[in-house]
Interface confidence: low
């Protein structure tokens, strides 16, 4: 079936990093820089992605294989293979489109990206807080009330400011 | 009449390096990527690593990717490769090729002999 | 890395014999094998390219066939300008790497 299939089509003989050029008499030609072809048999060379403003190079394009992009200091990758870079905050905020917004009381991000995220329910579980949740940290669940001794006091947040998983608008 | 010309000899001592030189004619230089390949007296071949002429880009077999550099010099369609710290391993033949498939095009190679 | 393993070393024919030289992938590299001539003193030439297509100029007694880890270079009729090594090499995968080559001398 192979042999068939080259006699049909000679560009199938052409490997990665060449294209098939029907200029050419279809001889396999290399693909010219800034091109590659990660397959055989192809009938064009595909352009190397550029790597450029808020993108860096991770790995340089080849002839058979296309660039790969991340992005500058205080941005992270967004998107398969990195098609987008975005901002980074601080931890103990979210990135709105105003710009990085501090967390709303009884909500945490403990990373540069991502939204923040409601303290998690002690009460919820029968527990009482053991620590109190920051900014930049959720609270630190311990035993149920029940285990405290006489006097002490438990604190639960107030009902979060959105739902969990809700992004910014 | 594509032509890929290296000079044929270099004598150099161990720990030094050398700049290998292939200056290229009869084509658009940058239309390919220029590939380096040694060998030693009466064995095979061995790919060091290829340089996107338009660009600069390169590619290096991790063996050589700390002694080996590879560099472009469009203005006169020259491209280079330095290797450093030679040792008697390197006395070798090296030539620069555009070597990916077809068309193929070999220099007539550099002959390297490190000896003190 | 992807290793090329050629077998035999040498062989020594007669002009006008069947020459069969072979080269082993150690992992599946398609159809993305080329094989050289290297005569005496003289740098590499292009031979086949794509395991099995004729570079341009190459008389048709030079045939290339094989896929993904065998392939295997065969000179119908041997001629005595054919006394060279024989050198077969991948451009699948990085690094591009080379056999160690066949030594073909004529009797």
């Known amino acids: 079936f192979e042999r068939t299939r080259s006699l049909q089509d000679p560009c199938s003989n052409c490997p990665a990093g060449t294209f098939c050029d029907n200029n050419r008499n279809q001889i396999c030609s290399p693909c010219p820089p800034n091109s590659f072809s990660s397959a055989g048999g192809q009938r064009t060379c595909d352009i190397c992605r550029q790597c450029k403003g808020v993108f860096r190079t991770r790995k340089e394009c080849s002839s058979t294989s296309n660039a790969e992009c991340d992005c500058t200091p205080g941005f992270h990758c967004l998107g398969a293979g990195c098609s987008m870079c975005e901002q980074d905050c601080k931890q103990g905020q979210e990135l709105t489109k105003k710009g990085c917004k501090d967390c709303c009381f009884g909500t945490f991000n403990d990373q540069k990206r991502g939204i923040c995220r409601p303290w998690t329910n002690c009460s919820l579980d029968g527990k009482s807080v053991l620590v109190n949740g920051t900014k930049e940290r959720d609270v630190v669940c311990g035993p149920s009330p029940a285990d405290l001794s006489p006097g002490a006091s438990s604190v639960t947040p107030p009902a979060p400011a959105r739902e969990p998983g809700h992004s910014p608008q | 009449q594509v032509q890929l010309q290296q000079p044929g000899a270099e004598l150099v001592k161990p720990g030094a390096s050398v700049m290998l030189s292939c200056k290229a004619s009869?084509?658009?230089?940058?239309?390919?990527?220029m590939h380096w390949v040694k060998q030693r007296p009466g064995q095979g071949l061995e790919w060091i690593g290829e340089i996107n002429l338009r660009n600069g880009g390169t590619n290096y077999y991790e063996k050589f990717k700390t002694r080996a550099t590879l560099t472009v010099d469009k203005s006169s369609s020259t491209a280079y490769m330095q290797l450093s710290s030679l040792t008697s391993e390197d006395s070798a033949v090296y030539y620069c090729?555009?070597?990916?498939?077809?068309?193929?095009?070999w220099g007539q190679g550099t002959l390297v002999t490190v000896s003190a | 890395n992807i290793v090329m393993t050629q077998s035999p070393k040498s062989m020594s024919m007669s002009v006008g014999e069947r020459v069969t030289l072979s080269c082993k992938a150690s992992?599946?590299?398609?159809?993305?094998v080329s094989w050289y001539q290297q005569k005496p003193e003289q740098s590499p030439k292009l031979l086949i390219y794509?395991?099995?297509n004729r570079y341009t100029g190459v008389p048709d007694r030079f045939t290339g066939t094989g896929s993904a880890t065998d392939f295997t270079l065969t000179i119908s009729s041997v001629q005595a300008e054919d006394l060279a090594d024989y050198h077969c090499?991948?451009?699948?995968?990085?690094?591009?790497?080379f056999g160690s080559g066949t030594k073909l001398e004529i009797k």
């Open positions: 794509g395991a099995s």
């Open positions: 090499g991948q451009s699948y995968s990085y690094p591009f790497t």
């Open positions: 992992d599946n590299v398609g159809i993305s």
């Open positions: 009869g084509y658009t230089f940058t239309s390919y990527w």
């Open positions: 090729t555009i070597l990916t498939s077809a068309p193929s095009y």
